[in-house]
Interface confidence: medium
Amino acid sequence: TEVKVTQPEKSVSVAAGDSTILNCTVTSLLPVGPIRWYRGVGQSRLLIYSFTGEHFPRIRNVSDTTKRNNMDFSIRISNVTPEDAGTYYCVKFQRGSSEPDTEIQSGGGTEVYVLAK
């Protein structure tokens, strides 16, 4: 069966300067390939976090994704700023051998509202 990506929160509200967790789980780790978080859609979408080892300031994974069969790909964004507002998508990719990774499933999106402190 096809992998399913679930983002249970439709939206989260966070005060500027605070941190927030964006939840995402998958039903399977197959097919082999990374999970990435984006803000926005289409041409304007911005890579926020990738579970592939790179360093992303202010963002880290919530659970230990090196553990076998971990299905939780939630992230924590620290020191939130008004520029962080937008809709975040958790996206599962299938790894390509020579060609680029292929996007196969996206979560429904979580809207982040940033409140003035």
Partner: antibody
């Protein structure tokens, strides 16, 4: 105070159509996702359809897909359910239900309107 | 789709007794579970969300617990107005949103 008032129910023959309305007040209608949930006589609750605040995102239960159409008019604070090709098994009380703004559970419900499909 | 199974189908108790209703999910829904009360001729009413948080205005004799696939709604001391049908609903999975089949709490 949140109010949801359904209307448009009645007795209709199989194969015919009916349009339900739900008038909303007491909250910013366009900011909330709203749903139709039904309950057949003597049965449990069954989710029917969902529409997002903007109207851009729509989902249907498999049992009504292709026959029912959900829509909303945010300028009139009204939710609609156009029901075509009605069947006896569509007989139920139809409720409109307002979702929580963060999660897909239902904070507020209307009193319901009864749809009876019978020849 | 996540299937919710409620048990028992009917619970026959006296006022003042404790009622324990169970809802089991076919797959984990974490704590994304709500409970509703429905009385004849009335709209359903939200009691519990997030598996254990009481909705506004709900008396503290109602409590929810559980996570993953097993959930419980407890009414610590039944009042006459509590005799009704209770439904659980999961909101973790994407639509279709699913309800359990209901538990009727009736007077002995």
């Amino acid at each position: 105070e949140v109010q949801l008032v359904e209307s448009g129910g009645g007795v209709v023959q199989p194969g015919r159509s009916l349009r339900l309305s739900c008038a909303a007040s007491g909250f910013t209608f366009s900011s909330y996702d709203v749903n139709w949930v039904r309950q057949a006589p003597g049965k449990g609750l069954e989710w029917v359809s969902l529409i997002s605040g903007s109207g851009e995102i729509i989902y249907y239960a498999d049992s009504v897909k292709g026959r029912f159409t959900i829509s909303r008019d945010n300028s009139k604070n009204t939710l609609y359910l156009q029901m075509n090709s009605l069947r006896a098994e569509d007989t139920a009380v139809y409720y409109c239900a307002k979702e929580n703004n963060r999660y897909r559970f239902f904070d507020d419900w209307g009193q319901g309107t009864l749809v009876t499909v019978s020849s | 789709e996540t299937v919710l199974t409620q048990s028992p189908g009917t619970l026959t108790l006296s006022p003042g007794e404790r009622a324990t209703l169970t809802c089991r999910a076919s797959q984990s829904v974490y704590t994304y579970l709500a409970w509703y009360q429905e009385k004849p001729g009335q709209a359903p009413r939200l009691l519990i969300y997030g598996a254990s948080s009481r909705a506004t205005g709900i008396p503290d004799r109602f409590s929810g617990s559980g996570s993953g696939t097993e959930f419980t709604l407890t009414i610590s001391s039944l009042q006459s107005e509590d005799f009704a049908v209770y439904y659980c609903q999961q909101y973790y999975d994407r639509p279709p949103l699913t309800f359990g089949g209901g538990t009727k709490v009736e007077i002995k």
